[in-house]
């Protein structure tokens, strides 16, 4: 399987992880977290990094603690350096994580999913149009 296909699988997997965590919003610490929305073009990877850095936490209520902690850790899986390089290209012009509006876990996860969907769409579009920078 090609690297691009694996990349798409990983991105879709992140959406599934977000969906799973949305089932457990009542078991998450009700903390407000920076949640990028309407991310400007070329700042997607920077915003992605903000979502990964956010301190999403299990409320340790017992029942679903294990699956929540595993899922949160998988959400923080680092993409390869090629993607990191793309993020760095626009780092200076992208908003800092702290500048984004803070939202509770439910909205945080919804916005993360929205960004992931946008990134997948862009990736597919760039492949369709033969662009390498995806």
């Amino acid at each position: 399987m090609q690297g691009q296909d694996r990349h798409m699988i990983r991105m879709r997997q992140l959406i599934d992880i977000v969906d799973q965590l949305k089932n457990y919003v009542n078991d998450l610490v009700p903390e407000f977290l920076p949640a990028p929305e309407d991310v400007e073009t070329n700042c997607e990877w920077s915003a992605f990094s903000c979502f990964q850095k956010a301190q999403l936490k299990s409320a340790n209520t017992g029942n679903n603690e294990r699956i929540i902690n595993v899922s949160i850790k998988k959400l923080k899986r680092k993409p390869p350096s090629t993607n990191a390089g793309r993020r760095q290209k626009h780092r200076l012009t992208c908003p800092s994580c702290d500048s984004y509006e803070k939202k509770p876990p439910k909205e945080f996860l919804e916005r993360f999913k929205s960004l992931l969907q946008k990134m997948i769409h862009q990736h597919l579009s760039s492949r369709t149009h033969g662009s390498e920078d995806s």
């Epitope: 694996r6 990349h7 997997q13 799973q20 089932n23 679903n64 294990r66 899922s71 899986r77």
Partner: antibody, heavy 126, light 106 residues
Framework: QVQLVESGGGVVQPGRSLRLSCAAS????????MHWVRQAPGKGLEWVAF????????YYADSVKGRFTISRDNSKNTLYLQMNSLRAEDTAVYYC???????????????????WGQGTTVTVSS | EIVLTQSPGTLSLSPGERATLSCRAS???????LAWYQQKPGQAPRLLIY???ARATGIPDRFSGSGSGTDFTLTISRLEPEDFAVYYC???????FGQGTKVEIK
């Protein structure tokens, strides 16, 4: 080929300890989380413990928490299960299994246990 | 913690017949987190399906998985002699297994 081989099972008295080992070969051991799963005679599968690929996190079933310790030595491609304060209800075949979700972004992405050992039998009896 | 309930407990069928196995979760499961395993007597389990519907490497296409939310199904379109075994569903992340469904020869 990809392979997991368990060892260390045997007959032990209640309250005693035993250490199981699982030797991995044929894949990059340090890129995969690992599990222990057990099966009591005539019963279904019971997940026992999981350790992250780098050992940074460990999770346990409530039935073994505080008594069993999962660990790994990535330099030796080996997974361990230290079992203390053994009880009759710990009698089972113990399997080690590879978690199918590699730490590598471009690696395997299966949310499941995709490689299993043949199992080692632990009997707790006085 | 989530509970997975499999039904029926035992399925008695003949080779060539279709087998439909059910796995019901006590709370919603993202489809990526649902796996199925096959275990034959004296053998280790084998991963059949991951992500509710994707076949693991080397698994014949007579095996298929479907479902979402709390209801999942494993279907074996035409039973072969080697398919008579016990089947388990599992939620990834909590790693809880269902109690199993035995598919036996009628």
């Amino acid at each position: 080929q990809v392979q997991l081989v368990e060892s260390g099972g045997g007959v032990v008295q209640p309250g005693r300890s035993l250490r199981l080992s699982c030797a991995a070969s044929g894949f990059t051991f340090s890129s995969y989380g690992m599990h222990w799963v057990r099966q009591a005679p005539g019963k279904g599968l019971e997940w026992v413990a999981f350790i992250w690929y780098d050992g940074s996190d460990k999770y346990y079933a409530d039935s073994v928490k505080g008594r069993f310790t999962i660990s790994r030595d990535n330099s030796k491609n080996t997974l361990y299960l230290q079992m203390n304060s053994l009880r009759a209800e710990d009698t089972a075949v113990y399997y080690c299994a590879r978690d199918g979700d590699s730490s590598d972004w471009y690696g395997d992405y299966y949310f499941g246990m995709d490689v299993w050992g043949q199992g080692t039998t632990v009997t707790v009896s006085s | 913690e989530i509970v997975l309930t499999q039904s029926p407990g035992t399925l008695s069928l003949s080779p060539g017949e279709r087998a439909t196995l059910s796995c019901r979760a006590s709370q919603s499961v993202s489809s990526s987190y649902l796996a199925w395993y096959q275990q034959k007597p004296g053998q280790a389990p084998r991963l059949l399906i991951y992500g509710a519907s994707a076949r693991a490497t080397g698994i014949p296409d007579r095996f298929s998985g479907s479902g979402s939310g709390t209801d999942f199904t494993l279907t074996i379109s035409r039973l072969e002699p080697e398919d008579f075994a016990v089947y388990y569903c599992q939620q990834y992340g909590s790693w809880t297994f269902g109690q199993g469904t035995k598919v036996e020869i009628k």
